[in-house]
Interface confidence: low
């Protein structure tokens, strides 16, 4: 099941509790603890910007702050993908990019960030209070999603700084994410804490304004964005989403599909019966949607007379039932 992962703001213990220690003694343990807690906990940032030249044109930029390899990025609007959101674009590192109106141009900016331009005219145009979400599937972190919208006060041409916006969700937070060094650090921290626990409390009254330990990551977000991490699922205002995208194409369906040339001239072996994966061969790991990892080629257990179709442990369409990419 989905779990909400929010990076905790690490508060040092209240003075006077557990044998109050001077804050200088605490710096190393708390830096280490910060590392231990946040190790392998990636973040997704989302930046929404209105173009100054075209007031109904938006640029959405998203990035993944994690060490894993990205296997898929899904951009949606109107809410998280799978929770009422509508897919705008899907970017796959090997298979290419697909987008639907009103997405005009989706592209990779770096190996871990993407941008999407939305053109707004007619019924399918976005507007200032539309929520855009980016979901990054990566190994080993799992699936992470963040959402954002244009800041209410922003002028055309301006944008909010890229922040890990209201939604930060991990289906599998940091599997295998703690490196040996951090593991050692955590063990050392426990050792320190145990020593402190058994040591008599110093008589000195600690400063009541001892600063918080810094987040020990080069990419630690600003204070404002840290605050955003603690906002639960955003209330999504969909009043400005198109009443229907059918006006763009009356017959509906994925008629706004666009693709880059793909490299898949062969049929990669997929995981489950009519499941398929965007990976080239058996034996490699694939990203997960909702929590379980499996190696490509592992067939899930049969569930009755038929084969288990889509529900590969790797997620909704890392295996794609009878219907998907091979």
């Amino acid at each position: 099941m989905r779990t909400e992962a929010q990076v905790p703001a690490l508060q040092p213990p209240e003075p006077g509790l557990e044998g109050a220690m001077g804050h200088r003694t605490l710096v190393l343990p708390w830096v280490l603890l910060t590392l231990c807690v946040t190790a392998g906990t990636p973040e997704v940032w989302v930046q929404v910007r209105m173009e100054a030249t075209e007031l109904s044109s938006f640029t959405i930029r998203c990035g993944f702050l994690g060490s894993g390899s990205i296997s898929l990025v899904t951009v949606s609007w109107g809410g998280p993908n799978g929770a009422g959101g509508t897919t705008l674009a899907v970017l796959h590192p090997e298979r290419g990019i697909r987008q639907w109106a009103p997405a005009r141009q989706a592209r990779w900016e770096t190996q871990s960030s993407i941008s999407l331009i939305l053109e707004g005219s007619g019924a399918s145009s976005p507007c200032a209070n539309t929520t855009f979400c980016c979901k990054f599937a990566s190994f080993p972190e799992g699936s992470w999603e963040a959402c954002g919208s244009l800041p209410p006060s922003s002028d055309p041409g301006l944008s909010a700084p890229p922040t890990p916006a209201p939604i930060l969700r991990a289906d599998l937070a940091g599997i295998l994410g703690v490196s040996g060094v951090l593991l050692f650090g955590c063990v050392y921290l426990l050792h320190l804490l145990r020593r402190h626990k058994h040591r008599p409390a110093p008589r000195l009254q600690p400063s009541r304004t001892s600063p918080q330990a810094p987040r020990a990551r080069a990419w630690a977000p600003s204070q404002a964005s840290q605050a955003a991490l603690h906002v639960p699922y955003a209330t999504i205002n969909t009043s400005c989403r198109p009443a229907t995208l059918d006006t763009a194409h009356p017959h509906g369906g994925p008629s706004w599909w666009a693709s880059l040339p793909t490299h898949a001239a062969h049929r990669p072996q997929g995981p489950a019966a009519w499941a398929s994966t965007p990976i080239p061969a058996r034996g490699s790991f694939v990203s997960v949607e909702n929590g379980l990892y499996a190696q490509a080629g592992e067939r899930p257990p049969h569930t009755g007379p038929g084969l288990t179709l889509f529900p590969d442990p790797r997620g909704p369409r890392a295996m794609e039932g009878p219907l998907g990419v091979r």
Partner: antibody, heavy 121, light 112 residues
Framework: EVQLVQSGAEVKKPGASVKVSCKVS????????MHWVRQAPGKGLEWMGG????????IYAQKFQGRVTMTEDTSTDTAYMELSSLRSEDTAVYYC??????????????WGQGTTVTVSS | DVVMTQSPLSLPVTPGEPASISCRSS???????????LDWYLQKPGQSPRLLIS???NRASGVPDRFSGSGSGTDFTLKISRVEAEDVGIYYC?????????FGQGTKVEIK
Amino acid sequence: EVQLVQSGAEVKKPGASVKVSCKVSGYTLTELSMHWVRQAPGKGLEWMGGFDPEDGETIYAQKFQGRVTMTEDTSTDTAYMELSSLRSEDTAVYYCATGVTTYYYYGMDVWGQGTTVTVSS
Amino acid sequence: DVVMTQSPLSLPVTPGEPASISCRSSQSLLYSNGNNFLDWYLQKPGQSPRLLISLGSNRASGVPDRFSGSGSGTDFTLKISRVEAEDVGIYYCMQALQTPPTFGQGTKVEIK
């Protein structure tokens, strides 16, 4: 734009065979798993079979086992469904369908226009 | 095979009013990864089926937001918040959990 364009209507006699084609455009067949669904007049939808990426083979619904053959010509990006030993109850509209929305499972979101097969003596 | 049962089989609606269709499966469609492998399709008169909702609640691209899917396990619901004249047709649910995928018998939505 992804499109599936099917061959025209067919009228067949009982015991004969019919071969329906489904031409893919806007995507390559090798990247899709094509499936076939039929609908008898006034009835619901019935899945017949489709490509299984796990084994690189086509799987068929038990009901049609031995009578249906699904093949592909990747050089022309065309999928075929052949049904043999036709009976009057095989009179139906036959659809090819595939799922191409994203790389996760999001349903059969592209369908051909359907091919009407009438079996009558 | 997984048996899919829809109700009602016929649903007269008034434009602007909400509508709801139920779909029940003989086995749970909730997989251990948290997804419900259930799709909703609409077949308008004389047309091919069209995907509306996948994975129980994921609206397909281009589908108006008046359509929403909910439910988990064996009980699912498709809701239309405000029916429009163009929404008439037959609505099918389909389970995508086991081979063969199976469809409900369909719910015919027509204007009163």
